[in-house]
Interface confidence: medium
C-alpha cells in the first residue's frame, strides 16, 4: 500500500515517504512547481472506544506514522504521493481545470460497449501489475526483513491490489506466531464504513481510467434492492452465472470462472507470522444464498433507511441504533432499529451472495463487489444531498479505532481523513444516475447533478 | 519452524540476581511480543508480562513490577528476563513464548 | 485486572468419555481467549485461539465455544494422550491472567 519508490532502506529508516517529481532530484514532492512539500504527517491521536484496548500493538494506530512521519502534502487541487495527480474532480496540467464529473450508471443500462469496457477493464486489472504501488509482506517491525537490508513488498496486480487494501483494513491484530487478537476493523462496523469504501472505489475507478486511457470512465452500480431470491447480475454476460457441475464456483463461459482470490487464508497468516503476499488461493466462489429463501433487500428498505436523519449514533459502533450509516452498512435493520438476528442492505447482500462474499477480508475478490459497494455508495450519496450534514455529524472522538472524523484512512496513502470524504460525489468528481424512486410520493428519478 | 530456546536450569541464593535467556528462531523476532510466565511446582500458571523486542515496550503484570525487568537483544534474537532479590517463592519454572509457541522453561531453585 | 475462573478444578474420566471445561472471564473479553494443554514436565502448547479456532496440528475432538464472559473447551471421545492440566487465558489487554487450571485424570 506504498509507493514503490519508497520502499527503500533509505526511505523505511529514515520513514520518510517523499518522492522528486520527474527527473530533477530537488523536484520532492513538486516543490518547484509549487505542487506541494516534505512535512510532517499529522494523525490522530483522540481516544477511540470499541473493543479494541490495546496501545502500541498494531500498525495501523496512528496511521501511517508506524512506517512513515514525513510524506507530501500538496497544495491546492495538487494530489498523489508526489503530488503529480490532482485531486478528484480535477484535470489539466495544473490541476486548474474541474472536470465533469464522470457519471454512474445502473449496470443494467450500459450499453453492450460500455458493459464490454467495464468487464475488460476488471480483467485487465487482475492482469496488469500496478504501475505505482506494492504490497507489504511483513509487519511493521519485520519491514526490513531479517538483516535490516531487504525491504519486505510484493508486487501486485491493480485489482489485487484493491482486494489487498480492504483485506489489511480488516485483518488481526497480530501479537504473536498464531496469536490473533480479533477486534478490529477500520472499515466496518462503524462511520468510516461509508468513507472507507467510497475512497476504495474512487481508486480503483482511478486506477481503471488509466489502464484503459479514458478519463470519463465510471463504475457502474449493481441496484441490488430488488427483494428477490436470485442474483440478476449473476449471468454470463455480467459477473458469471452458477457452474452446473458445482455451482458454487462460477461459468466457465465467464471471464470470472477463472480469477483467483488473494488474501483469504487468515489462519495462514496468523500462523506463519506474515500478511497476505498476493499469491494465488483458488478459485473464486459464491454460493447464492437465494435458493435457501434468503432474500435480497428491498426499495421500502432503501426507503426507510434514508429517512434516518442522524448519520451514526453513540457508541458509533455495530449496535448503533437509529443510525443511517449502521442500518445501511446493515448491522441494525433498515429502519433503525436493532435485532441480533436480522442483516439488512450492505451485509445481507454480501451474506446473499455467499462464498468469496461472506467474510470482510475476502470479499473484494469477487467483481460484485465494485457494483455492490457502488450501489451503497449511492445511498450514502443521496442521504449526504438530502440532509446536507455538518463536519460534526460525524464524532471527533470515541468511535472505534479508525472511525474517528480525523483518522486516516488505513491503509491508504497518502493519508487522507475521514472528513475529506464525508462530501456529496459530486464534489468528489462524480455522480450517479440513478432510476430508483426514494420516498412513496415521489416520482422515478434521482437527481444526478 | 518456530522455535524458542530457554537457558538452563538455575540453583540461586536467596538475595541474589539471575538473567534468564530465550532465543528464538524461525520469525520475525522484532515485530512480536515476547511473554514470560511462571509456574511454581504443583500450581497454576502466572502471566509475568511481555516485551515487544524491535521497539523495546513492555508490559507488566504489576505483582512482579520491581522483581522481573524484560531486555532484547535483536542482533541474537534474545530476550531476558532478570529476577532480583530472589527469595524461595521465585522457586519456579519459568517459560518464554510468542503467540502459539512457548519455549521448553527453565526451572529456578532458590536456596540457602 | 481480569479474573478468570476455571471449573471444574480436576476431573477423573475414563477413555471415551466426552468433556467440557469452563472458562469465566469477569468482564467481556470479547473471545480473546486461548486454550492450553500441558503434560507432566511439558510446556503448555496451544489447542485453541480466539475462542473457536483450532490450533494447527491440534485434533478435531477438541472444540472451542463461547463469547462475552462465558467460554468452553469440549473434548469428544477422550483418549489417553488427552490426560494432563489444561488451562484458558485472556489476551484482553494485560496482564493476559490465566484460569486456575482443570487437572483431567484417568479414572
Known amino acids: 500500500q506504498f509507493p514503490r519508490v519508497c520502499m527503500t532502506v533509505d526511505s523505511l529508516v529514515n520513514k520518510e515517504c517523499c518522492p522528486r517529481l520527474g527527473a530533477e532530484s530537488a523536484n520532492v514532492c513538486g516543490s518547484q512547481q509549487g505542487r506541494g512539500q516534505c512535512t510532517e504527517v499529522r494523525a490522530d491521536t483522540r481516544p477511540w472506544s470499541g473493543p479494541y484496548i490495546l496501545r502500541n500493538q498494531d500498525d495501523r494506530e496512528l496511521w501511517p506514522r508506524k512506517f512513515f512521519h514525513r510524506t507530501c502534502k500538496c497544495t491546492g487541487n495538487f494530489a498523489g504521493y508526489n503530488c503529480g495527480d490532482c485531486k478528484f474532480g480535477w484535470t489539466g496540467p495544473n490541476c486548474e481545470r474541474k472536470k465533469p464529473p464522470v457519471i454512474r450508471q445502473n449496470i443494467h443500462s450500459l450499453s453492450p460497449q460500455e458493459r464490454e469496457q467495464f468487464l475488460g477493464a476488471l480483467d485487465l486489472a487482475k492482469k496488469r501489475v500496478h504501475p505505482d504501488y506494492v504490497i507489504t509482506t511483513q509487519h511493521w517491525l519485520g519491514l526490513l526483513g531479517p538483516n535490516g537490508t531487504q525491504p519486505q513488498f510484493a508486487n501486485c496486480s491493480v485489482y489485487d491490489f484493491f482486494v489487498w487494501l480492504h483485506y489489511y483494513s480488516v485483518r488481526d491484530t497480530l501479537l504473536g506466531p498464531g496469536r490473533p487478537y480479533r477486534a478490529i476493523d477500520f472499515s466496518h462496523q462503524g462511520p468510516a464504513f461509508v468513507t472507507w469504501h467510497r475512497y476504495h472505489l474512487l481508486c480503483l475507478e482511478r486506477d481503471l481510467q488509466r489502464l484503459i486511457g479514458n478519463e470519463s470512465f465510471a463504475l457502474p452500480y449493481w441496484n441490488f434492492a430488488t427483494g428477490r431470491n436470485e442474483c440478476d447480475v449473476c449471468t454470463d454476460q455480467l459477473f458469471g452465472a452458477a457452474r452446473p457441475d458445482d455451482p458454487t464456483l462460477i461459468s466457465r463461459n465467464s471471464r470470472f470462472s477463472s480469477w483467483e482470490t488473494v488474501c483469504d487464508s487468515l489462519d495462514d497468516y496468523n500462523h506463519l507470522v506474515t500478511l497476505c503476499n498476493g499469491t494465488y488461493e483458488g478459485l473464486l466462489r459464491r454460493n447464492q444464498m437465494g435458493r435457501n429463501s434468503m432474500k435480497l433487500p428491498t426499495l421500502k428498505d432503501i426507503r426507510d433507511c434514508l429517512s434516518l436523519q442522524k448519520f451514526d449514533n453513540p457508541p458509533f459502533f455495530q449496535n448503533s441504533t437509529f443510525s443511517f450509516r449502521n442500518a445501511l452498512e446493515g448491522f441494525d435493520k433498515a429502519d433503525g432499529t436493532l435485532d441480533s438476528q436480522v442483516m439488512s442492505l450492505h451485509n445481507l447482500v454480501h451474506s446473499f451472495l455467499n462464498g468469496t462474499n461472506a467474510l470482510p477480508h475476502s470479499a473484494a475478490n469477487d467483481p460484485i463487489f465494485v457494483v455492490l459497494h457502488s450501489f451503497t455508495d449511492a445511498i450514502f450519496d443521496e442521504w449526504m444531498k438530502r440532509f446536507n450534514p455538518p463536519a460534526d455529524a460525524w464524532p471527533q472522538e470515541l468511535a472505534p479505532i479508525g472511525h474517528n472524523r480525523m483518522y486516516n484512512m488505513v491503509p491508504f496513502f497518502p493519508p487522507v481523513t475521514n472528513e475529506e470524504l464525508f462530501l456529496t460525489s459530486d464534489q468528489l468528481g462524480y455522480s450517479y444516475a440513478i432510476d430508483l424512486p426514494v420516498s412513496v410520493e415521489e416520482t422515478p428519478g434521482w437527481p444526478t447533478t | 519452524q518456530v522455535q524458542l530456546q530457554q537457558s538452563g536450569a538455575e540453583l540461586m541464593k536467596p538475595g541474589a540476581s539471575v538473567k534468564l535467556s530465550c532465543k528464538a528462531t524461525?520469525?520475525?523476532?522484532?515485530?512480536?511480543?515476547i511473554e514470560w510466565v511462571k509456574q511454581r511446582p504443583g500450581h497454576g500458571l502466572e502471566w509475568i508480562g511481555e516485551?515487544?523486542?524491535?521497539?523495546?515496550?513492555?508490559n507488566y503484570n504489576e505483582k512482579f513490577k520491581g522483581k522481573a525487568t524484560f531486555t532484547a537483544d535483536t542482533s541474537s534474537n534474545t530476550a531476558y528476563m532478570q529476577l532480583s532479590s530472589l527469595t524461595t517463592e521465585d522457586s519456579a519454572i519459568y517459560y518464554c513464548a510468542s503467540g502459539a509457541y512457548w519455549g521448553q522453561g527453565t526451572l529456578v531453585t532458590v536456596s540457602a | 485486572d481480569i479474573q478468570m475462573t476455571q471449573s471444574p478444578a480436576s476431573l477423573s474420566v475414563s477413555v471415551g468419555e466426552t468433556v467440557t471445561i469452563t472458562c469465566r472471564a469477569s468482564?467481556?473479553?470479547?473471545?480473546?481467549l486461548a486454550w492450553y494443554q500441558q503434560k507432566q514436565g511439558k510446556s503448555p502448547q496451544l489447542l485453541v485461539y480466539?475462542?473457536?479456532n483450532l490450533a494447527d496440528g491440534v485434533p478435531s475432538r477438541f472444540s472451542g465455544s463461547g463469547s462475552g464472559t462465558q467460554y468452553s473447551l469440549k473434548i469428544n471421545s477422550l483418549q489417553s494422550e488427552d490426560f494432563g492440566s489444561y488451562y484458558c487465558?485472556?489476551?484482553?489487554?494485560?496482564?493476559?491472567?490465566f484460569g486456575g487450571g482443570t487437572k483431567l485424570e484417568i479414572k
Open positions: 468482564e467481556n473479553i470479547y473471545s480473546n
Open positions: 487465558q485472556h489476551f484482553w489487554g494485560t496482564p493476559y491472567t
Open positions: 480466539a475462542a473457536t
Open positions: 516485551i515487544l523486542p524491535g521497539s523495546g515496550s513492555t
Open positions: 524461525g520469525y520475525t523476532f522484532t515485530g512480536y511480543w
